[in-house]
């Protein structure tokens, strides 16, 4: 066969679908690799061909489009399963070609089993809701294109294993699920089951997502430096180890980049000719507020180092703050016997 532009196996789209449910999979060529769409390709005389490699096999084989009840079919650039079976798992290839042109891409399709409580190996999308923020909604995802707008499906929502009805602050509204006031107790997995008729058959679409309740932008504040502070003085003798923690609290802010850094005499620690190490740790609260701690460490501090200015800085989308650590040289205690002897005029 003549040369074909092979885009390889596209794992950026690891497609997972539930067993015994309809699945519609668009050929990724038109979405991510080619500069034209299916209609343009079709009118230019190009044909879209589908084939697959079963799981744990090397042999590419054509897809059987002559199964009973058209279980697998192709419509434009979409491959349809009505419904899927477990052994449909494999790598699928769509190839666009005519006598002079050829381009193809493969992608993995995994058919996944679920239990009666919707638990499965499916990777779940996460939807973040702001705590105590007023009415917020989640929408049943990835159901477009499965049925025409004239069909009115029935939608049932579940939290974990339990059907959502008469919940205090969670109300099903068709494809949407409304949270009147989101609380930590609303964290969990939510599933919508969409049931619709087609050609005398009934199909179910199951979609699960994880809800995570996070800090509200109403309560967000600029970074707060807990340490260093005015109450702690880092008093050291030359030769001792100097350890100064910079501990900063950051309110949760969607996608905000939180930064913590030390400057020594106004410079980046690396730019000072002393042996400084900085180690950072990060922890999160239940609402994803973040605490970052950066420990500045000088193994053997000199009297010169103890005169320097050590400033902890923090920055988030809410603002920037800085705080200097109080560092000083320990005044040596009087050496008692010598001092006393001198006091008594001993020679």
């Amino acid at each position: 066969s003549e040369r074909c532009d092979d885009w390889g196996l596209d794992t950026m789209r690891q497609i997972q679908v539930f067993e015994d449910e309809p699945a519609r999979i668009k050929c990724p060529l038109f979405e991510h690799f080619l500069k034209f769409n299916y209609s343009t390709a079709h009118s230019a005389g190009l044909t879209l061909i589908w084939y697959w490699t079963r799981q744990d096999r090397d042999l590419e084989e054509p897809i059987n489009f002559r199964l009973p009840e058209n279980r697998i079919s192709k419509e434009k650039d979409v491959l349809w399963f009505r419904p899927t079976l477990l052994n449909d798992t494999g790598n699928y290839t769509c190839m666009l070609r005519n006598t002079t042109y050829c381009s193809k891409v493969a992608f993995p399709l995994e058919v996944v089993q679920k239990d009666s409580c919707f638990n499965s190996p499916m990777k779940l999308p996460v939807h973040k809701l702001y705590i105590e923020y007023g009415i917020q909604r989640i929408t049943c995802p990835n159901v477009d294109g499965y049925f025409p707008s004239s069909v009115k499906p029935t939608i049932t929502w579940y939290m974990g294993c339990y059907k959502i009805q008469n919940f205090n602050n969670v109300i099903p509204e068709g494809m949407n699920l409304s949270f009147l006031i989101a609380l930590i107790s609303n964290n969990g997995n939510y599933t919508c089951v969409v049931t619709y008729p087609e050609n005398g058959r009934t199909f179910h679409l199951t979609r699960t997502l994880t809800v995570k309740v996070v800090g509200s932008p109403k309560n967000a504040v600029p970074p707060v430096i807990h340490s260093p502070n005015d109450h702690v003085v880092y008093e050291k003798e030359p030769g001792e180890e100097l350890l100064i923690p910079c501990t900063v609290y950051f309110s949760f802010l969607m996608d905000s980049r939180n930064e913590v850094w030390w400057t020594i005499d106004g410079k980046k620690p690396d730019d000072i000719t002393i042996d400084v190490t900085i180690n950072e740790s990060i922890s999160h609260s239940r609402t994803e507020d973040e605490t970052r701690t950066q420990i500045l460490s000088i193994k053997k501090v000199t009297s010169e180092d103890l005169k320097r200015s050590y400033v902890c800085h923090a920055r988030s989308a809410k603002g920037e703050v800085a705080k200097a650590a109080k560092v000083k040289q320990k005044v040596p205690a009087p050496r008692y016997t010598v001092e006393l002897a001198c006091g008594f005029g001993a020679t």
Epitope: S256, R257, I278, I282
Partner: antibody, heavy 118, light 106 residues
Framework: QVQLQQPGAELVKPGASVTLSCEAS????????IHWVKQRPGQGLEWIGE????????TYNEKFKNKATLTVDKSSSTAYMQVSSLTSEDSAVYYC???????????WGQGTTLTVSS | QIVLTQSPAIMSAFPGEKVTMTCRAS?????MHWYRQKSGTFPKRWIY???KLASGVPARFSGSGSGTSYSLTISSMEAEDAATYYC?????????FGAGTKLELK
């Protein structure tokens, strides 16, 4: 001398995986985050993600979540990026760079040219 | 994600001429950073925190702006300034770069 060293080039077949390396020297490796940036021929810069060698915390650009995996080896002061299921779209120069606080990307590696071809 | 739009995409200037290039953000950002890249080499940090010059950057360069509109200015173009300049936002994830402004010498 403060530097980030990367191999010059890698040639890999479509569908395979490759691990790119970035060796840090001349500074305390654990004090800086290591970032990876992609640049396709004649195109702009795309941020892939970052890793903190101190605690291994990573943040990825959603676009590269299923494509790149970042790791570090503190003992050799080396950062790694594994790029999986390679396609010709992955052919690019990959740079490692570092940041500390507001000192953004103040040091870059020379870049590794990755070519995906059968 | 925040999209950064740089303009113009390509520009040219005579030696001694004043040059201004802009970077617009799709949402407000706290700071803008600029990198310079010459053909075949890695990018170099050029201006950070909107207006601070990285070490070794000539004083003829300056940066300004706030919110969604930022700019890089060269007071007097020199031959060595010919390069591609990228703006970058760091306020939110993912970190994003502009598509670059290619500055050529006339």
């Amino acid at each position: 001398q403060v530097q980030l060293q990367q191999p010059g080039a890698e040639l890999v077949k479509p569908g395979a995986s490759v691990t790119l390396s970035c060796e840090a020297s001349g500074y305390t490796f654990t004090s800086y985050w290591i970032h990876w940036v992609k640049q396709r021929p004649g195109q702009g810069l795309e941020w892939i993600g970052e890793i903190n060698p101190s605690h291994g915390h990573t943040t990825y650009n959603e676009k590269f979540k299923n494509k790149a995996t970042l790791t570090v080896d503190k003992s050799s002061s080396t950062a790694y990026m594994q790029v999986s299921s390679l396609t010709s779209e992955d052919s690019a120069v990959y740079y490692c760079t570092r940041h500390y606080g507001s000192y953004y990307f103040d040091l870059w590696g020379q870049g590794t040219t990755l070519t995906v071809s059968s | 994600q925040i999209v950064l739009t740089q303009s113009p995409a390509i520009m040219s200037a005579f030696p001694g001429e004043k040059v201004t290039m802009t970077c617009r953000a799709s949402s407000s950002v706290s700071y803008m950073h600029w990198y310079r890249q010459k053909s075949g080499t890695f990018p170099k940090r050029w201006i950070y925190d909107t207006s601070k010059l990285a070490s070794g950057v000539p004083a003829r360069f300056s940066g300004s702006g706030s919110g969604t509109s930022y700019s890089l200015t060269i007071s007097s173009m020199e031959a060595e300034d010919a390069a591609t300049y990228y703006c970058q936002q760091w306020s939110t994830n993912p970190i994003t770069f502009g598509a670059g402004t290619k500055l050529e010498l006339k």
